[in-house]
Structure formats: C-alpha cells, structure tokens
Interface confidence: low
C-alpha cells in the first residue's frame, strides 16, 4: 500500500534569463528511494540514482544543474521553459510517486512586479 505523499514547490514563476530551483519531497513513507527522474512534459531532464548518482540529459547539460538535494536547478531561463515539470520518485517497495510543478517564465518587467503564482 502506497502511503507516501509528494510535496512540491507547486506553481512558481521566474524571470527570463534567471534561474529557478525545482524541489520535491517525499514524506509519510518508509520506502527506499532508488531513483528520482525529472521530466518536462515528455522529455527527460535528469536522473538522480541512489547508487549511480546524477545524470543530466545531454540536450539539457548546459542549462540544468543537479541539486540542491534531489532537486533540480534550471538556468538561463527562456519563455519556452514555461510548462509542467514532474518529479518521479522510484521507490521500493511502494512503487512510483509523481509530483507536478508548473513553471511560468516571465519577461523581466512582469517579474519585477511580483510573481503571478504563490507557492502553496
């Protein structure tokens, strides 16, 4: 039985050209995390594997940095980075938990007047 829950940074906004940290946290389970996948829509961004460590997808190597922790840092943001991001926790024995984050990348002038989204 899957008892865990994923807490995420929820809906967030960031400034074009800046960077953002995507964070998920798995709680309320004693299951062992074997791997965390970070995906954007249908694209794999990065993997953090408990034994093998981090691997960043080659097409994102220049703009994605591992961490902090099991999170992911996106750099040099563009408007095209707007969209859904998923953290997928592979665990044993529970199985797979998925968290969702929506990122909106704003033009500088808009971002300066405050985020449109609040972190819940």
């Amino acid at each position: 039985m899957m008892t865990g829950t994923i807490e995420t940074t929820g809906n967030i906004s960031a400034e074009k050209g800046g960077s953002i940290i995507l964070q998920c946290h798995l709680s309320s389970t004693t299951a062992q995390v074997t791997q965390v996948n970070w995906e954007q829509q249908d694209q794999l961004l990065a993997i953090c594997n408990a034994d093998l460590g981090w691997h960043i997808s080659p097409s994102f190597k220049d703009r994605v940095a591992p961490g902090p922790g099991l999170g992911l840092t996106l750099q040099s943001l563009t408007v095209n980075d707007t969209g859904e991001y998923f953290c997928i926790y592979h665990t044993y024995p529970d199985g797979t938990y998925t968290g969702r984050i929506f990122l909106e990348v704003l033009e500088s002038s808009v971002a300066e007047h405050g985020a449109r989204f609040q972190i819940p």
Partner: nanobody
Framework: EVQLVESGGGLVQPGGSLRLSCAAS????????MGWFRQAPGKEREGVSA???????TYSDSVKGRFTISRDNSKNILYLQMNSLRAEDTAVYYC???????????????????WGQGTLVTVSS
Amino acid sequence: EVQLVESGGGLVQPGGSLRLSCAASGYKYGVYSMGWFRQAPGKEREGVSAICSGGRTTYSDSVKGRFTISRDNSKNILYLQMNSLRAEDTAVYYCAARPLWTGDCDLSSSWYKTWGQGTLVTVSS
C-alpha cells in the same frame, strides 16, 4: 560501490559460440538497465545489446539474430550468448549499467554510468 566484472571471453573459430557473463555487485540489480558494448582495435566503442526495464531487449543490426542477451536477477548476472561468430566480432566486450528511466531501451552509451573492465573476444581460424 557498484562493480561489474565480465568473464567468458577467449579465442573461438568463425562460426563458433561463446557466452559472456557479467557479475554485478553493490546494488539492487533489478533497478537498472544493463548493456553490452564492444570496442574493436582502432575503432570506437559501439553498443551491442541491452536489456531494460520490463525485460525489453534491443540489439545492434550487426548482431541481431546471432546474439542473445539475458539476465539472472537471482544471481545478479548478465549474459550475452554469441553464436555464428565472425572475424568482425573480435573486440573487447564491456558490460555496463544504466539507471532505470522512462525512455526507450536504446544503446546510447552516454546513459551508462558504470562499466566493467572488459573481456577480450577473438574470432580467428
């Protein structure tokens, strides 16, 4: 620490068979996809075969129908059964481990993070 140790290489005549083994230690084997790669003298390393999550397999065109990849999860061993060997199969064969993920079962070596030391296969009369 994850370790991969290959064995089973050697000298074989054209048309002959060999079975390579790769003993894996230091992690929960079922979490990973595993692959065999080879590097012939003076050539770049190339993918041979992989066995991925759910038991899916893939083979390079040059070995399809001749080689069979399999694994024994209870013993943490990966196998490559090589039949109808040709001179062009001569190479050092490497076992490699890659993280499980939701993508295709492919032979892109950039995804493989852990490598064995290799075992030499020589096909010659």
